[in-house]
């Protein structure tokens, strides 16, 4: 199976959404757990994660094309405590498959703004609490 994981982020007002997306075929979903870790360079696991999502095969989806499943972790107001290195991961003990996304970081600046780095270039985001916009 060709399964991969990507990381992205989006802003809604003061809220920051960290999104882990797993691309897979319908029949590959069962047995997978997707999870998001913070500051876990070597031992990112569902047990040490901020949030986890168990994938289920959706009988309502027809065809064998690639589909995506998303885990979303929402930070209602980014603070210095949220600074750190994050990683999206997925794993299936049933199949012995482990997917580890690229590390990305949240950096809270002294001016009260924060940046998210390490995502794909088009997903390299800079946020300002004051203006509530992407910059």
């Amino acid at each position: 199976g060709c399964i991969n994981i990507t990381s992205s982020a989006s802003q809604e007002g003061t809220r920051l959404n960290l999104i882990c997306t797993v691309w897979h075929k319908k029949e590959e979903a069962e047995g997978f757990v997707v999870f998001l870790c913070k500051d876990r360079s070597g031992d990112c696991s569902p047990e040490t994660s901020l949030k986890q999502l168990r994938l289920k095969r959706d009988p309502g989806i027809d065809g064998v094309g690639e589909i995506s499943s998303q885990l979303m972790f929402t930070i209602s107001q980014v603070t210095p405590l949220h600074s750190g290195t994050y990683q999206c991961c997925a794993r299936s003990q049933k199949s012995g498959i482990r997917l580890q996304g690229h590390f990305f970081s949240i950096l809270f600046t002294e001016t009260g703004n924060y940046t998210v780095t390490g995502l794909k270039q088009r997903q390299h985001l800079e946020f300002s609490h004051n203006e509530g916009t992407l910059s």
């Epitope: 060709c2 069962e30 299936s92 003990q93 049933k94 012995g96 498959i97 482990r98 997917l99």
Partner: antibody, heavy 112, light 107 residues
Framework: QVNLQESGPGLVQPSETLSLTCTVS????????INWFRQPPGKGLEWMGT???????DYNSALKSRLSISRDTSKSQVFLKMNSLQTEDTAIYFC??????WGQGASVTVSS | DIQMTQSPASLSASLGETVSIECLAS??????LAWYQQKPGKSPQLLIY???SLQDGVPSRFSGSGSGTQYSLKINSLQSEDVATYFC?????????FGSGTKLELK
């Protein structure tokens, strides 16, 4: 069709090193991980360790100091090496694709 | 390590009967439990994973249930080919651990 086949010596001397090979077909080791399990005669199952699809490994802490799992993806083979064998290591050793497809097992006796 | 206590150790049942095997984990394993069937001289076969998901190709007379620390395997309408030893396994925490097995025989 998914197939796994364990191979290695049937008899190992105490204090020697056990080397087993798991040869797989019907899938790629870069897409699936392999677990090693063992089962002493007439007893239950013990998980030994995992080599993931990305080549990373996890080991049973009780065996970690003398166990090593590696692979050669081009030959579709996974290798188990365990040193300082004792009679209590006598068992049938299984490799499995994750949890869902198992080899038939390789019988290993530790005896002088 | 998580201890898996499986009961009964052995079980005798008649064809067509429904049988249940229990597995108790020493701590919450969050449904990360598998059931295997092993026939004499053969390797284990995965029946159930994630406590209640039926592995492809396994007859629907097998079912799994439970949560937290208590899990069970049920076999409806027992068939002669179901004579085997059954093991539970937790895969929530390293090291993965197994129950001691239940030997199922025909009356």
């Amino acid at each position: 069709q998914v197939n796994l086949q364990e191979s290695g010596p049937g008899l190992v001397q105490p204090s020697e090193t056990l080397s087993l090979t798991c040869t797989v077909s019907g899938f790629s080791l870069t897409n699936y991980g392999i677990n090693w399990f063992r089962q002493p005669p007439g007893k239950g199952l013990e998980w030994m360790g995992t080599i993931w699809n990305d080549g990373g490994t996890d080991y049973n802490s009780a065996l970690k100091s003398r166990l090593s799992i590696s692979r050669d993806t081009s030959k579709s083979q996974v290798f188990l090496k365990m040193n300082s064998l004792q009679t209590e290591d006598t068992a049938i050793y299984f490799c499995a694709r994750g949890m869902d497809a198992w080899g038939q097992g390789a019988s290993v006796t530790v005896s002088s | 390590d998580i201890q898996m206590t499986q009961s009964p150790a052995s079980l005798s049942a008649s064809l067509g009967e429904t049988v249940s095997i229990e597995c108790l984990a020493s701590e919450d394993i969050y449904n990360n439990l598998a059931w295997y069937q092993q026939k004499p001289g053969k390797s284990p076969q995965l029946l159930i994973y994630y406590a209640n998901s039926l592995q492809d190709g396994v007859p629907s007379r097998f079912s799994g249930s439970g949560s937290g620390t208590q899990y069970s395997l049920k076999i409806n309408s027992l068939q002669s080919e179901d004579v085997a030893t059954y093991f539970c396994q937790q895969y929530n925490n390293y090291p993965f651990t197994f129950g001691s097995g239940t030997k199922l025989e025909l009356k």
